[in-house]
Amino acid sequence: QRLPRMQEDSPLGGGSSGEDDPLGEEDLPSEEDSPREEDPPGEEDLPGEEDLPGEEDLPEVKPKSEEEGSLKLEDLPTVEAPGDPQEPQNNAHRDKEGDDQSHWRYGGDPPWPRVSPACAGRFQSPVDIRPQLAAFCPALRPLELLGFQLPPLPELRLRNNGHSVQLTLPPGLEMALGPGREYRALQLHLHWGAAGRPGSEHTVEGHRFPAEIHVVHLSTAFARVDEALGRPGGLAVLAAFLEEGPEENSAYEQLLSRLEEIAEEGSETQVPGLDISALLPSDFSRYFQYEGSLTTPPCAQGVIWTVFNQTVMLSAKQLHTLSDTLWGPGDSRLQLNFRATQPLNGRVIEASFPAGVDSSPRAAEPVQLNSCLAAGD
């Protein structure tokens, strides 16, 4: 059952110009961890769950083998007794990078390029999306999601990592951007603003939305996140804007109702499994896509960004709960956790639908300025 969504037909955003980034520097969280699959009998997971850098921390993932499923590491190392039938043993090790990406923050020192040189790259995220300049690409088919419907048990880890609130996803959530472009979901997290100040990362014609959800995926071509970092298409993020609507969003309420439990930085709780796809817009066929980066250190490039045209609606109270409950480092509220938009530097944003065509009566023959790069696909 779908929750109320909006903006089903018209391209996202209005013509109004959102406020400029309140952040001096480009700052953002890192795509975080995700768990491993179940061990087969006799092999309970022995995960090395460490922090991996990136858009809210990225976990390590072990590929499916005959007897295990895909594995994904989490933040903190834990070692347990042997023996779980559906939890393949996790022996993969995450190689820590030389730079310490754990010490960064939004809007201040140290400058992100000092934390990770990739943050000064030419093809960074987020970006401002201008539908009129997007290249309509008919080859971009509707996204396919499989296994995103989770029963209440086992429960999922919801964590305040000081940069965002992050939900670690179990193995088996499969996503396809198209034929041969297959991914596994690792985690999801949110970006938001503050009272009266929007906090989405991406913008549409300069308009910033109240908040934004990111679902981070690892390509099935890679066994581990650190192998995929910086590789074209190694990681993919599904992004959707959150807007204010008249009704409570029941899917989001399952997470938002637990935020008080993790108000303190570094705290976590367990939440019942839920329909992860219900956190996304219902229209998987209309979206923008471009190649960018993680929006937090290490800012690795080669990330395929898919930004839904349709938005997700939350009540005003829910948006307030999101932006006004969590605390970050140094006794400061966890707010405005978004990075400034980055220059396209010649990149072309593709659209799966003719976004440049304004359907309003005053539109005369609109011109699509950019052509689809994947036209031959």
């Epitope: 768990p35 491993r36 699959e37 179940e38 061990d39 087969p40 009998p41 309970e44 997971d45 499923g69 347990e80 007794a81 042997p82 023996g83 779980d84 039938p85 559906q86 939890e87 499989l146 296994g147 995103f148 419907q149 989770l150 029963p151 209440p152 048990l153 086992p154 429960e155 179990p170 193995p171 088996g172 367990q270 019942p272 499994g273 796809s277």
Partner: antibody
């Protein structure tokens, strides 16, 4: 290795009560959700109840809701099923099972304990 | 009447291949919930055979495989052996009924 051992079964009259226990070892008990599944003589498997690792969330089949209570003592690595207002149709072998950390499958099962409800 | 429907029995000769179907509805398998398979040898507790539609726990031979499509799932057993004679159950989650099992399928070797 993972071991689950049920106990507490036996013969009870209709309307009576019984408390089943499941002693767990070989894994970090508090990290895993647990479940009870039963099997009537000569019949198939029927899910009865489940509980989260912390014990904060519990779930029941409609057939036992209001009569059975699942609980756990993580300090004792033990899962419980308190069965009240027992009926003849509750007669079955009761298994405790360990739910996976990332899968809803039941990866390990105990050997079961027989509950007979009869006058 | 089980929420997930399995054939009551299947049979095959040693070395042959058999499949066991598990048919659900839009509130369970069709809604995207994973399917798991269990083997119960006579007089013993069930044992996990396939989890999350297609994955085999360690120790389960490659002769056993699972698949899922739309509102149904299947368990395939190739190279049938005498000790495969058992009851097989599928299990999933149902949005209205919580965890659900199929009625079970008795595999008999000819």
């Amino acid at each position: 290795q993972v071991q689950l051992q049920e106990s507490g079964g036996g013969l009870v009259q209709p309307g009576g009560s019984l408390r089943l226990s499941c002693a767990a070892s070989g894994f970090t008990f508090s990290s895993y959700a647990m479940s009870w599944v039963r099997q009537a003589p000569g019949k198939g498997l029927e899910w009865v109840s489940a509980i989260s690792g912390s014990g904060g969330s519990t779930y029941y089949a409609d057939s036992v809701k209001g009569r059975f209570t699942i609980s756990r003592d993580n300090s004792k690595n033990t899962l419980y099923l308190q069965m009240n207002s027992l009926r003849a149709e509750d007669t079955a072998v009761y298994y405790c099972a360990k739910i996976g950390r990332y899968s809803s499958s039941l990866g390990y099962w105990g050997q079961g304990t027989l509950v007979t409800v009869s006058s | 009447q089980s929420v997930l429907t399995q054939p009551p029995s299947v049979s095959g000769a040693p070395g042959q291949r058999v499949t066991i179907s598990c048919t659900g509805s839009s509130s369970n398998i069709g809604r995207g919930y994973n399917v798991h398979w269990y083997q119960q040898l006579p007089g013993t507790a069930p044992k996990l055979l396939i989890y999350d539609n297609t994955n085999r726990p360690s120790g389960v031979p490659a002769r056993f495989s699972g698949s899922k499509s739309a509102t149904s799932a299947s368990l395939a057993i190739t190279g049938l052996q005498a000790d495969d004679e058992a009851d097989y159950y599928c299990q999933s989650y149902d949005s209205g009924l919580r965890w659900v099992f199929g009625g079970g399928t008795k595999l008999t070797l000819l």
